[in-house]
């Protein structure tokens, strides 16, 4: 039925950038500026986004596909398709209500969006901070205390033949 | 109005920088393109800088031609020049939010020559 | 690439008479497509954009039409002013910053 349907109707024809115009006969006409369609067979041309305010035109409208957004400097998307644009903060913030806030003790964001993340808890994994933490700069975990030990070897020992059984860790 | 200037007689392999000065609207509005002609010949896209700042080259200019813009100005600096880019550049204004030039300017030659 | 072809290279017709230039895309452009008339020692002047949009103060003379690959510039009521080289040029964005916005070769219309 479809494959009929598709035969005996003439706007089946009509290629993406056009529209099946029912005012001429149904002829193929290409979509008007500022406008596209993305798909053959379309009726109508759907209106082009305007890239306006906060935001930019990435790429402009063409006759087959939409244009693209991005913002302008000191936002960031947010989104499908850039729907929204998010003010930036600097590192070491994350956004709130009421604007941009230093990220609190023990937290960091090294980005220009997001939100502040907690500092890595390195004894977790059995070892010491190297380097401590910013509100920019996540902590650098090193070797583990003992590691550290007076007479403790600097090269590190073979590793133990694994137990039959034990999984990688 | 669309002015270029710049054009002049150069050695294979000397950079060049092209400028286009603009008066009567804004830049950051409008699709700024440029276009070459070499003596003779058809007419050859080169690129454009978008109202949003974005740039976009043919893939014969990419990485040997660099659109920038002020407020006023768009520049079209050229390196590695050969015998083959001897041509009348044009700058031009996009028409309506798009990339066709319509507001063209006359032209300014650049000769590659040893 | 995207190829335009277009024909013929060169046409003459009477004053009064009809041009019709063809431009082929190599690939479906859409609509996106451009004629513009170009005369000795002058830049270029748009004629028509998407196909069939007539350009700002241009003539109802000139009439662009088509989609996808095949595209044609009709010149009707020929003028001594309309001799000049005709050429198309579509829109098409490749990947990343990449653009195929490649002018046809051009045709020149000569008035009897």
């Known amino acids: 039925f479809e494959r009929t349907r598709s035969l005996q109707d003439p706007c089946s024809n009509c290629p993406a950038g056009t529209f099946c115009d029912n005012n001429r006969n149904q002829i193929c006409s290409p979509c008007p500026p500022n406008s596209f369609s993305s798909a053959g067979g379309q009726r109508t041309c759907d209106i082009c986004r305007q890239c306006k305010g906060v935001f930019r035109t990435r790429k402009e409208c063409s006759s087959t596909s939409n244009a693209e957004c991005d913002c302008t400097p000191g936002f960031h998307c947010l989104g499908a398709g850039c729907s929204m644009c998010e003010q930036d903060c600097k590192q070491g913030q994350e956004l709130t209500k009421k604007g941009c806030k230093d990220c609190c003790f023990g937290t960091f964001n090294d980005q220009k969006r997001g939100i502040c993340r907690p500092w890595t808890n390195c004894s977790l994994d059995g070892k010491s901070v190297l380097v401590n933490g910013t509100k920019e700069r996540d902590v650098v975990c090193g070797p583990s205390p003992a590691d550290l030990s007076p007479g403790a070897s600097s090269v590190t020992p073979p590793a133990p033949a694994r137990e039959p059984g034990h999984s990688p860790q | 109005s669309v002015e270029e200037s710049g054009g002049r007689l150069v050695t294979p392999g000397t950079p060049l920088t092209l400028t286009c000065t603009v008066s009567?609207?804004?830049?950051?509005?409008?699709?700024m393109i440029w276009v070459r002609q070499a003596p003779g010949e058809g007419l050859e896209y080169i690129g454009f800088?978008?109202?949003?700042?974005f740039t976009y080259y043919a893939s014969w200019a990419k990485g040997r031609f660099i659109i920038s813009r002020t407020s006023t100005t768009v520049d079209l600096k050229m390196t590695s020049l050969t015998v083959a880019d001897t041509a009348t550049y044009f700058c031009?204004?996009?028409?309506?939010?798009?990339?066709?030039?319509?507001?063209w300017g006359p032209g300014t030659l650049v000769t590659v020559s040893s | 690439d995207v190829v335009m072809t277009q024909t013929p290279a060169s046409v003459s017709e009477p004053v009064g008479g009809a041009v019709t230039i063809k431009c082929q895309a190599s690939q479906s452009i859409g609509s996106d497509l451009a004629w513009y008339q170009q005369k000795p020692g002058q830049p270029p002047k748009l004629l028509i954009y998407r196909a069939s949009t007539l350009a700002s103060g241009v003539s109802s003379r000139f009439k662009g039409s088509g989609s996808g690959t095949e595209f044609t510039l009709t010149i009707s009521d020929l003028e001594c002013a309309d001799a000049a080289t005709y050429y198309c040029q579509c829109i098409y964005y490749g990947s990343d910053d990449v653009i195929y916005h490649t002018f046809g070769g051009g045709t020149e219309v000569v008035v009897k």
């Open positions: 800088i978008n109202d949003g700042g």
């Open positions: 031009a204004r996009g028409v309506d939010g798009t990339s066709y030039p319509d507001l």
């Open positions: 009567g609207f804004t830049i950051n509005s409008y699709h």
